[in-house]
């Protein structure tokens, strides 16, 4: 019952141009090109997009025109391969152009870089931005799409259109305001933070599809949609899962036009059938397309239906469990996951998937046993420790967060994770641990019933960042093991890691701990990152350092920065006091 049963079109490019309209077509092609060729200058991409757009218009006018029958991958790939500096800029990626479709597109996908060597985006003065916006609004917004897409090569393209719409609205409103900065800067901060979160969430979806396959993604979607739409029946949830899987497969595969088109169709279907899906969709469905799709994706869980009987009758107590499992495996397990998830909005999706996997493993074992019913009769008892583990972990970490506050909680995680996987690069450890630490302010404020889905599913997203960054330059077998063995057990795998006893401490390098007056002009966030970078390096030098030792050194460091930033001759202070600090720290840590 998919919503995407379309007639074949003579010209795919004409079909998508007509469906999406010129503005969205151009934006999506720009995103696609920027996500593939992340180093190309903006002007080059705009030129390519304009050429593709002009070609699409000829196909709209006459679908039988030359090359109009070619696939989008062929058309776009041919266009990308015309870039003159491909070999110099991208090295072996240029070899992709020697391949035929579909191998060529697969080759481009494999060369997407999650951590491209691009300068950090620096925000210009508000007046400068407003002038640029008014001078050429179209170019200004295209530049936004380009800069985000090239830094986030898996960003969910239709959602990026929504961000761009909000970006435009912010400038339209705030550049006319009396206090432009007060109006604009909080909006841009919000868009930046939401954008990073959106990128990370989508990256996990793509990793799930690409590394663990469609079945893994579908299982995730069944669990999540069953929690969100507990009144929807199984056939409805299954249909939504099929369609959602198609949308995300397309976007993760670089098929952004199809993805955006199919996402719009899915939103339309959901709104036309909201009576049989969820009572929470009414407001979403009154919004324009981009807002509607975003709203549906974020909609709160519907209330659980009344009169749900115990699951034990059908899935444990029945003597026919093995017959049902053997004769209809996927439906039976899918139904189990659906029924369990709709009853448990208080569980994380990854926990629900662990329970489903445990159930499946038990049936595989027990249905081959002499007395299957006796064997699987206690399967629900096996769930108890699986449920209690994340509950206890979240309780402990929320207590620690409430005691320490976000910055110090991040520091505790920095130490914890550096000791677990000290081979990982310092910038990655800082970025990942800072994000792990944000779970506190994001989730600990919630009541018990919402903590686990908030915390553990967020941690899955953050740990996936570690996994994709580590995959680019693997340095730790332990990280590789936790990242590749099981998608749903990544967090427990990392939690279970102890201090890496095989690690040989890093040589002491005074330069790592030398600071200059420029630290004083940094924002509070940037200053924290500097201090946290030093903390990771300390642990790498002295992995056996105690909490107390590290705390003492960090307190001294904070005092040193504060003192020198108040000094008249800051640079001299940093040079002289810095030497003393390094010596004192070495003594304190026994280096």
């Amino acid at each position: 019952r998919g919503v995407f049963r379309r007639d074949a079109h003579k010209s795919e490019v004409a079909h998508r141009f007509k469906d999406l309209g010129e503005e969205n077509f151009k934006a999506l092609v720009l995103i696609a090109f920027a996500q593939y060729l992340q180093q190309c200058p903006f002007e080059d991409h705009v030129k390519l997009v304009n050429e593709v757009t002009e070609f699409a218009k000829t196909c709209v006018a006459d679908e039988s025109a030359e090359n109009c029958d070619k696939s989008l991958h062929t058309l776009f790939g041919d266009k990308l391969c015309t870039v003159a500096t491909l070999r110099e800029t991208y090295g072996e990626m240029a070899d992709c152009c020697a391949k035929q479709e579909p191998e060529r597109n697969e080759c481009f996908l494999q060369h997407k870089d999650d951590n491209p060597n691009l300068p950090r985006l620096v925000r210009p003065e508000v007046d400068v931005m407003c002038t640029a916006f008014h001078d050429n609004e179209e170019t200004f917004l295209k530049k936004y799409l380009y800069e985000i897409a090239r830094r986030h090569p898996y960003f969910y393209a239709p959602e990026l259109l929504f961000f761009a719409k909000r970006y435009k609205a912010a400038f339209t409103e705030c550049c006319q305001a009396a206090d432009k900065a007060a109006c604009l800067l909080p909006k841009l901060d919000e868009l930046r933070d939401e954008g990073k979160a959106s990128s990370a969430k989508q990256r996990l979806k793509c990793a799930s599809l690409q590394k663990f396959g469609e079945r893994a993604f579908k299982a995730w979607a069944v669990a999540r949609l069953s929690q969100r739409f507990p009144k929807a029946e199984f056939a409805e949830v299954s249909k939504l899962v099929t369609d959602l899987t198609k949308v995300h497969t397309e976007c993760c595969h670089g098929d952004l036009l199809e993805c955006a088109d199919d996402r719009a169709d899915l939103a339309k279907y959901i709104c036309e059938n909201q009576d049989s899906i969820s009572s929470k969709l009414k407001e979403c469905c009154e919004k324009p397309l981009l807002e509607k799709s975003h709203c549906i994706a974020e909609v709160e869980n519907d209330e659980m239906p009344a009169d749900l009987p115990s699951l034990a009758a059908d899935f444990v107590e029945s003597k026919d469990v093995c017959k049902n499992y053997a004769e209809a495996k996927d439906v039976f397990l899918g139904m189990f996951l659906y029924e369990y998830a709709r009853r448990h909005p208080d569980y994380s999706v990854v926990l629900l998937l662990r329970l489903a996997k445990t159930y499946e493993t038990t049936l595989e074992k027990c249905c081959a046993a002499a007395d299957p019913h006796e064997c699987y009769a206690k399967v629900f008892d096996e769930f108890k420790p699986l449920v209690e583990e994340p509950q206890n972990l979240i309780k402990q970490n929320c207590e620690l967060f409430e005691q320490l506050g976000e910055y110090k909680f991040q520091n505790a995680l920095l130490v914890r994770y550096t000791k677990k996987v000290p081979q990982v690069s310092t910038p990655t450890l800082v970025e990942v641990s800072r994000n792990l630490g944000k779970v506190g302010s994001k989730c600990c404020k919630h009541p018990e019933a919402k903590r686990m889905p908030c915390a553990e599913d967020y941690l899955s997203v953050v740990l996936n960042q570690l996994c994709v960054l580590h995959e680019k330059t693997p340095v730790s077998d332990r990280v590789t093991k936790c990242c590749t063995e099981s998608l749903v057990n990544r967090r427990p795998c990392f939690s279970a890691l102890e201090v890496d006893e095989t690690y040989v401490p890093k040589e002491f390098n005074a330069e790592t701990f030398t600071f200059h007056a420029d630290i004083c002009t940094l924002s509070e966030k940037e200053r924290q990152i500097k201090k946290q970078t030093a903390l990771v390096e300390l642990v790498k030098h002295k992995p056996k350092a105690t909490k107390e030792q590290l705390k003492a050194v960090m307190d001294d460091f904070a005092a040193f920065v504060e003192k020198c930033c108040k000094a008249d001759d800051k640079e001299t202070c940093f040079a002289e006091e810095g030497k003393k600090l390094v010596a004192a720290s070495q003594a304190a840590l026994g280096l």
Partner: antibody, heavy 120, light 108 residues
Framework: EVQLVESGGGRVQPGGSLRLSCAAS????????MNWVRQAPGKCLEWIGH???????YYATWAKGRFTISRDNSKNTLYLQMNSLRAEDTATYFC??????????????WGQGTQVTVSS | AFELTQSPSSLSASVGDRVTITCRAS??????LAWYQQKPGQPPKLLIY???DLTSGVPSRFSGSGSGTDFTLTISSLQPEDFATYYC??????????FGCGTKLTVL
């Protein structure tokens, strides 16, 4: 509106056959275990069998062989094929929806029933 | 397959009375028992499931208890609309189900 409507009942001679239908509206049959239950005049409720979400049919011991349950998901309709009918098969036949895809009970949703009379 | 024995098979009572109907299974069915009310010319209506869970919309004067083999349906204060036939149903032990033979509740 969520409902079940049975049809196909009537008078049939002993030894004859009859196919009852149960049309579902407001929900998808394929999501549930769908049951047939009968009730002879002034008598107990008697479960005949069901077909679950995995398309596996189960029957009461007495119904095996003579009765067959099937469904057509595209028509959202459940069927009961009854062969070699006897006088004691005279009853009102209900279709009823299980709580889930593999549930044997409870039945919250019932049709109004269709009357089958077996007599010469 | 297990059998369900309902008792009494018929019962007369007055409005305001407290009424108890029992259902005994020939083997343990844990808590997998439902109670239905049926009036002439109508299909059964689900009152209680999983032995003691009240179906939404059913008045709270109806309650169920028991587990294993012995189960009870109680109507705490009989109302005029409660005169009907009541059935128990056991389910969940396999992919088959069984109904009790009913208790006809009439006006005294």
């Amino acid at each position: 509106e969520v409902q079940l409507v049975e049809s196909g009942g009537g008078r049939v001679q002993p030894g004859g056959s009859l196919r009852l239908s149960c049309a579902a509206s407001g929900f998808s049959l394929s999501s549930y275990a769908m049951n047939w239950v009968r009730q002879a005049p002034g008598k107990c409720l008697e479960w005949i069998g069901h077909i679950n979400a995995g398309d596996i049919a189960y029957y009461a011991t007495w119904a095996k062989g003579r009765f067959t349950i099937s469904r057509d998901n595209s028509k959202n309709t459940l069927y009961l094929q009854m062969n070699s009918l006897r006088a004691e098969d005279t009853a009102t036949y209900f279709c009823a929806r299980g709580a889930g895809g593999f549930s044997t009970g409870p039945f919250k949703l019932w049709g109004q029933g269709t009357q089958v009379t077996v007599s010469s | 397959a297990f059998e369900l024995t309902q008792s009494p098979s018929s019962l007369s009572a007055s409005v305001g009375d407290r009424v108890t109907i029992t259902c005994r299974a020939s083997e343990s069915i844990n808590s997998r028992l439902a109670w239905y009310q049926q009036k002439p010319g109508q299909p059964p209506k689900l009152l209680i499931y999983d032995a003691s869970d009240l179906t939404s919309g059913v008045p709270s004067r109806f309650s169920g208890s028991g587990s294993g083999t012995d189960f009870t349906l109680t109507i705490s204060s009989l109302q005029p609309e409660d005169f009907a036939t009541y059935y128990c149903q056991g389910y969940g032990g396999s992919s088959t189900t069984t109904f009790g033979c009913g208790t006809k509740l009439t006006v005294l």
